[in-house]
Interface confidence: low
């Protein structure tokens, strides 16, 4: 008789999840010499240990501490790029600008990027059918708690000038409920971070508005200023040209505003 299984509102664990995590770990440690000491089997064991046999609505940051410890990594604290609702462009940017890092350029971020996972209380099974949805089911689910944990640590580590890429095409350019708005903003350390510089990415070809005047950007500025961190904002009117100019800064067309 098949055992009754909890039906959650969100998609189930990504197919071949253990294999994917292990393969990504091996690939990452091969590409990044400073992480060659990492034992990927131990990383997977720690990852698995964070959620297997645990109720998927009762996960805590504490559950992920063994994984955090194994994934400890040195990132230049003044080269951090945060992003909100514009992941692809942020990743394209750090692929070109190799000395800057998003969370997904670190080992732990790379392992989990775009994956879903959850287990079941009191069984060692991975649930491939469904996992809790953050809104409809519970916020303390394995995926949400993981990203909250690594995002908090990443923001805490930042120093000097921190950049954030924001999506100017959305109704809320800065969303207080996003990971950036709810976790990262509040974990930047005022003693280490001098300035948060927002890059607002425009979507429309003919969009010449100053989106730095958007009310949600003003709200972000207010939150940041109250935390004793300076705020600056730049419009990126042409993201395609912006990337091109990062690749080739000598191009004559790159002297004008992007």
């Amino acid at each position: 008789v098949p055992r009754w299984r909890q039906q959650w509102s969100g998609p189930g664990t990504t197919k071949r999840f253990p294999e994917t995590v292990l393969a990504r770990c091996v690939k990452y440690t091969e590409i990044h010499p400073e992480m060659r000491h990492v034992d990927c089997q131990s990383v997977w064991d720690a990852f698995k240990g964070a959620f297997i046999s645990k109720h998927p609505c009762n996960i805590t940051e504490e559950d992920y501490q063994p994984l955090m410890k194994l994934g400890t990594q040195t990132v230049p604290c003044n080269k951090i790029l945060l992003w909100s609702r514009i992941k692809d462009l942020a990743h394209q940017f750090t692929q070109v600008q190799r000395d800057m890092f998003t969370l997904e350029d670190t080992l732990l971020g790379y392992l989990a990027d775009d994956l879903t996972w959850c287990g079941e209380f009191n069984t060692s099974k991975i649930n491939y059918q469904s996992c809790p949805d953050w809104r409809k089911d519970c916020s303390n689910n394995p995926v949400s708690v993981f990203w909250k944990t690594v995002s908090r640590r990443f923001a805490e580590a930042a120093c000097d000038v921190v950049h954030v890429m924001l999506n100017g095409s959305r109704s809320k350019i800065f969303d207080k409920n996003s990971t950036f708005g709810s976790v990262e903003v509040h974990n930047l350390q005022p003693e280490k971070v001098q300035t948060l510089e927002a890059w607002v990415i425009h979507g429309g070809r003919e969009d010449s508005r100053d989106l730095c005047q958007d009310p949600t950007i003003k709200e972000l500025e207010s939150i940041i200023s109250k935390r004793n961190i300076q705020f600056s904002c730049k419009n990126i009117y042409r993201p395609d040209k912006f990337l091109q100019c990062v690749k080739n800064p000598e191009d004559s067309s790159c002297t004008s505003e992007i």
């Epitope: 410890k69 400890t72 990594q73 040195t74 990132v75 604290c77 003044n78 640590r153 990443f154 805490e156 580590a157 120093c159 000097d160 350390q189 005022p190 003693e191 280490k192 001098q194 200023s225 109250k226 935390r227 004793n228």
Partner: antibody, heavy 120, light 111 residues
């Protein structure tokens, strides 16, 4: 050079308040957080909190929230700490301290300390 | 709060000897390669003086006989060889997380 000069010793009664000052010189007062640290006899040093004189923003150790109030007068380059509802365990030397600057979040500069004695 | 436990509480040594003071944190004070642990020296009637910052960097003007090491939860301050002016109280301090906290202190006294 950076200097932090604190006000003189105070003897106060239980239940009263005390306000001490820390005058800064040798740097741009509005650009750095001013921290306060408590040294009570036989106890470990305790961080009370800081004020950012640039905009008056404060950050308190939860333990001192509500009884310690940090303020700053930018025109006089002076930071203040007021402690209310004093009790015997508030008898201590209170230091103001400044960090080394951006990415240097450790106390490089210290005032000479203000001794507060709570006694009836 | 992160609790810092220093040992020993008192250390009795002679000038010329080597002093080793330990500081253990209740949780890791590392963040992306930096150990947010600092060491101070305090003499009677004086404010603390910064010796070592970020676990192992010597502050300006601090002699080379002072060194710091460690990561995660375990940190060490070493003074070698001891000079007569080194006898004082030593504190560790973390600022990885609010509230910033100090160790209980180690009194280094002349034997």
């Amino acid at each position: 050079q950076v200097q932090l000069v604190q006000s003189g010793a105070e003897v106060v009664k239980p239940g009263a308040s005390v306000k001490m000052s820390c005058k800064a010189s040798g740097y741009t007062f509005t650009s750095f957080n001013m921290h306060w640290v408590k040294e009570a006899p036989g106890q470990r040093l305790e961080w009370i909190g800081y004020i950012y004189p640039g905009n008056g923003g404060t950050n308190y150790n939860q333990k001192f929230q509500g009884r310690a109030t940090l303020t700053a007068d930018t025109s006089a380059s002076t930071a203040y700490m007021e402690i209310s509802s004093l009790r015997s365990e508030d008898t201590a030397v209170y230091f103001c301290a400044r960090t080394g600057g951006l990415r240097r979040a450790y106390f490089t500069y210290w005032g000479q300390g203000t001794l507060v004695t709570v006694s009836s | 709060d992160i609790v810092l436990t220093q040992s020993p509480a008192t250390l009795s040594l002679s000038p010329g000897e080597r002093a080793t003071i330990s500081c253990r944190a209740s949780e890791s004070v590392d963040s992306y390669g930096n150990g947010f642990m600092h060491w101070y020296q305090q003499k009677p009637g004086q404010p603390p003086r910064l010796l070592i910052y970020l676990a192992s960097s010597r502050a300006t003007g601090i002699p080379a006989r002072f060194s710091g090491s460690g990561s995660g939860t375990d940190f060490t301050l070493t003074i070698s060889p001891l000079e007569p002016e080194d006898f004082a109280v030593y504190y560790c301090q973390q600022n990885k997380e609010d509230p910033w906290t100090f160790g209980g202190g180690t009194k280094l006294e002349i034997k």
